[in-house]
C-alpha cells in the first residue's frame, strides 16, 4: 500500500521538516522560517508558537518541532501546554483575587500553587496526631491509642495557638 | 485586589494623536505586561499591541506605524498613544494584563474620532 | 494573521437547552484558544482557556473542547444571565486575533 500510495502520491515521500509544495510541481520544499512540519507528507507547514510576555522559550521551534513555552520565573503554568500563567504563591499561602494569603488555620499549601487543604483528621482513621499541622505542612498521624504498649501514651502536643491575622504579600 | 481602569479624552480630532492611560493596582508593573484591545461599537476585538515586563513592546502590524506603548512604573502606569487617527479609530479601548489569556481587563473607555 | 471566524453570527436558545458555538482558525494554534462572554457595557470575560480549562469561578455549564483548528464552546444548560456576545481568541501566535463574535439569545 506504500509503495501504491507514493507511486500516486508523491507529497508522501517529503520528510518532516518540508512540505508538498503545490507551487512547485509538488516537489519538497523546506519549511518557511517560524513554521515546522513534524511529519512526512504535509502539505503546508504549521505556524511556531510564540512565546512572549508572560512566557518564556522552554524550547525552541525548529524545521520538525514546534516552540514550546514556560512561565516567567515567579509564574507557574496552567492548562496542557502552558496555555496561561499564574503567579506563585509562598508555601503555606493560596492565590486569591487579591494576591497571595496565608492559609486559615487548621489548612495547609505545600506547593508554590493551588490552594491551602485542610489538614488530615486523625481521629477519622482512629489515629492520633504524632506531629502538628502548620500553614505549609499537614499533621503527621501516629498509631491510635489502642496499638499503644500497655503504659505508653499518645504524644499528642496541643493544637497551635491561631495564627495572626492575614496581610497581603 | 487585581484593577485597571483605561483613562484619556473621549473626544479626540481627526489626524490628532489619542492618548489614553491604564492605571493599575494590585500588581506590580515590573511583573506583569499589559496588552491594548479595541473594540469598534457594535463590532468585535481587535488586538493592538502589548508591553511586557521588561519594558519591550510587540505590535500588530496594522497599527505600527502610529502607534506607541510605554509604562511609567513610579505611577503605576501603561500608556498607549495612536497617532493620525481618523473615524475607524472610534472604539473603546481596553488594557488587559498579561497572563496569557487575558483574564483581568479594564472597564474600557471610549474614544470618538470626530471634528 | 490567524484568522478566526465564527460560527454561528447569532444564535436563540431555549431556556434549560444546550447551546453551542463554534471557531475555526485558518492555521493550527494547537489548544491555544480561548473563550470569552461579553455583556453590554462590559469588558470581555474569560470563560475557557487553553480550549477546555474552566477559568476560576466560571459555572460547569461552560465547557470548550477542539483542538488545530476546529473549537467549541459548549453551554449545557443556558440559564438567563447567559445571554450575551461571546469570543474565541487565539493566543498562539501573534497578532493575536479574535473571532467576530457570537451574539447568543434566548428564545
Known amino acids: 500500500f506504500e509503495r501504491t500510495r507514493s507511486l500516486q502520491d508523491p507529497c508522501s515521500n517529503c520528510p518532516a521538516g518540508t512540505f508538498c509544495d503545490n507551487n512547485r510541481n509538488q516537489i519538497c520544499s523546506p519549511c518557511p522560517p517560524n513554521s515546522f512540519s513534524s511529519a512526512g507528507g504535509q502539505r503546508t507547514c504549521d505556524i511556531c508558537r510564540q512565546c512572549k510576555g508572560v512566557f518564556r522559550t522552554r524550547k525552541e521551534c525548529s524545521s520538525t518541532s514546534n516552540a514550546e513555552c514556560d512561565c516567567t520565573p515567579g509564574f507557574h503554568c496552567l492548562g496542557a501546554g502552558c496555555s496561561m500563567c499564574e503567579q506563585d504563591c509562598k508555601q503555606g499561602q493560596e492565590l486569591t483575587k487579591k494576591g497571595c494569603k496565608d492559609c486559615c488555620f487548621g489548612t495547609f499549601n505545600d506547593q508554590k500553587r493551588g490552594i491551602c487543604r485542610p489538614w488530615t483528621n486523625c481521629s477519622l482513621d482512629g489515629k492520633s496526631v504524632l506531629v502538628n499541622g502548620t500553614k505549609e505542612r499537614d499533621v503527621v498521624c501516629g498509631p491510635s491509642p489502642a496499638d499503644l504498649s500497655p503504659g505508653a501514651s499518645s504524644v499528642t502536643p496541643p493544637a497551635p495557638a491561631r495564627e495572626p491575622g492575614h496581610s497581603p504579600q | 485586589q487585581v484593577q485597571l481602569q483605561e483613562s484619556g479624552p473621549g473626544l479626540v480630532k481627526p489626524s490628532e494623536t489619542l492618548s489614553l492611560t491604564c492605571t493599575v493596582s494590585g500588581f506590580s508593573l515590573t511583573t506583569y505586561g499589559v496588552h491594548w484591545i479595541r473594540q469598534p461599537p457594535g463590532k468585535g476585538l481587535e488586538w493592538i499591541g502589548a508591553i511586557w515586563s521588561g519594558g519591550s513592546t510587540d505590535y500588530n502590524a496594522a497599527f505600527i506605524s502610529r502607534v506607541t506603548i510605554s509604562v511609567d512604573t513610579s505611577k503605576n502606569q501603561f500608556s498607549l498613544k495612536l497617532s493620525s487617527v481618523t473615524a475607524a479609530d472610534t472604539a473603546v479601548y481596553y488594557c488587559?494584563?498579561?497572563?496569557?489569556?487575558?483574564?483581568?481587563w479594564g472597564q474600557g473607555t471610549l474614544v470618538t474620532v470626530s471634528s | 494573521d490567524i484568522v478566526m471566524t465564527q460560527s454561528p453570527d447569532s444564535l436563540a436558545v431555549s431556556l434549560g437547552e444546550r447551546a453551542t458555538i463554534n471557531c475555526k482558525a485558518s492555521e493550527n494554534v494547537g489548544t491555544y484558544v480561548s473563550w470569552y462572554q461579553q455583556k453590554p457595557g462590559q469588558p470581555p470575560k474569560l470563560l475557557i482557556y487553553g480550549a477546555s480549562n474552566r477559568y476560576t469561578g466560571v459555572p460547569d455549564r461552560f465547557s470548550g473542547s477542539g483542538s488545530g483548528t476546529d473549537f467549541t464552546l459548549t453551554i449545557s444548560s443556558l440559564q438567563a444571565e447567559d445571554v450575551a456576545v461571546y469570543y474565541c481568541?487565539?493566543?498562539?501566535?501573534?497578532?493575536?486575533?479574535f473571532g467576530q463574535g457570537t451574539r447568543l439569545e434566548i428564545k
Open positions: 481568541g487565539q493566543t498562539y501566535s501573534y497578532p493575536l486575533t
Open positions: 488587559a494584563r498579561d497572563d496569557g489569556s487575558f483574564a483581568n
